[in-house]
Interface confidence: low
Amino acid sequence: GELETSDVVTVVLGQDAKLPCFYRGDSGEQVGQVAWARADAGEGAQELALLHSKYGLHVSPAYEGRVEQPPPPRNPLDGSVLLRNAVQADEGEYECRVSTFPAGSFQARLRLRVLVPPLPSLNPGPALEEGQGLTLAASCTAEGSPAPSVTWDTEVKGTTSSRSFKHSRSAAVTSEFHLVPSRSMNGQPLTCVVSHPGLLQDQRITHILHVSFLAEASVRGLEDQNLWHVGREGAMLKCLSEGQPPPSYNWTRLDGPLPSGVRVDGDTLGFPPLTTEHSGIYVCHVSNEFSSRDSQVTVDVLDPQEDSGKQVDLVSAS
């Protein structure tokens, strides 16, 4: 006959490990007892349990409550045992010694590897600002046994660098994602993907990028100067910019205070019926925590009477 076992048994931390040891013998052969021992213990073999065909299972004090037989139905030739609630310290080599009649004794060794699934964490880097050079966007750390893999899933262009720290029977892996911040990255997802044999599926942690920026400011509303004439109602100037964080707007007049009746409503400057007093240089001041921008425009309110008078003068002059 021969013993059937596995070269390597893999179990996830906290789960039960089945240590297989099955005697495949000729008909009529019997298994008297199966002795399980930790084969790589410091001071020789450390006994786990003795499985006797007549007296049942005896577990050594060091493993009391942790070694059981698999649930029924049981094959009398099966010397497999369950090691409950596997911990990293259980990693190593185990030996089963099977005493059979009449064939004698057989022994087999297996290696138990305890997988420790990682619990990844993602740490955002310092605040991202447009105009910076290569900057840390985020780092992702995962510790497990064996060493987990940490990768990044993103549409954002960047570079990754990884380092790992090995401990006893485990490793901590940290991957960093660096990028050159630009406004197009704002709101884009950056996902840390952690792979490990102890995980049923990859673990993913997503970080939304926030890049501080402030676009150039511009003013809309003066596209058709002929509309800015005395008496016109509903005239307005709108300041255009965008930023992260969203900017605030402030309007001033360069050549004096804002005329009475002119309303400031955020990015919009609203005028009452126009008079020539509304002519002047207006400044839109845009700012956020990152930066500030200015845009100025010259408003020239046309007085049709003045214009026609000038035209008459011009005609008579000719």
């Epitope: 596995s6 070269d7 390597v8 893999t10 590897r113 997988l115 064996p146 893999s149 990768t151 990884s162 790992s164 090995k166 993907v193 792979s195 490990h196 044999p197 102890g198 995980l199 049923l200 599926q201 990859d202």
Partner: antibody, heavy 116, light 108 residues
Amino acid sequence: QVQLVQSGAEVKKPGASVKVSCKASGYTFTGYYIHWVRQAPGQGLEWMGWINPNSGGTNYAQKFQGRVTMTRDTSISTAYMELSRLRSDDTAVYYCAREDWDFDYWGQGTLVTVSS
Amino acid sequence: EIVLTQSPGTLSLSPGERATLSCRTSQSVSSSYLAWYQQKPGQAPRLLIYGASNRATGIPDRFSGSGSGTDFTLTISRLEPEDFAVYYCQQYGSSPITFGQGTKVEIK
């Protein structure tokens, strides 16, 4: 006993693709990463990448990014490596290997010949 | 990437002699992540040593590994006829995984 059995030799034309299989037996397929390593005639060993059979997660060597795809089918305990846009310098023996930190078991290798 | 440099490229020895193979890494490698493989013509590589100094299952004790940092050594205390082959070192602690170019141990 642990075995990694690979598919047979292939002859391909430049520009074509090849898909090599690696069937695992004798162990829990989803418990170990599978790596792919190639060896050009008379040359050394070159790592191509890995797949985590449990999750399907992959990691490819920079050199093969965009040309290599590693997949698996857990129902039949088989890993696959597909290399596209083949060139003559892709002629090599392709090995799968099981990772237990080190590569403790290897497939027998699959010779891929790229020739016009 | 970490470059592994093996020396000598070829080692010509007689059976019974001692073989000493060197593997130098361009950056320090934890000894836990260095392995040695043996490859015979037409065969797949076979794991000899893992963790720099641990013999794999079924490997005779004439094979031993040592070293740390950037210098690692594989020693075959007394060469047997079946030991003439190509030997590769490998680091598997840093991505990408890399191999040395190999040392051929041939019969003198």
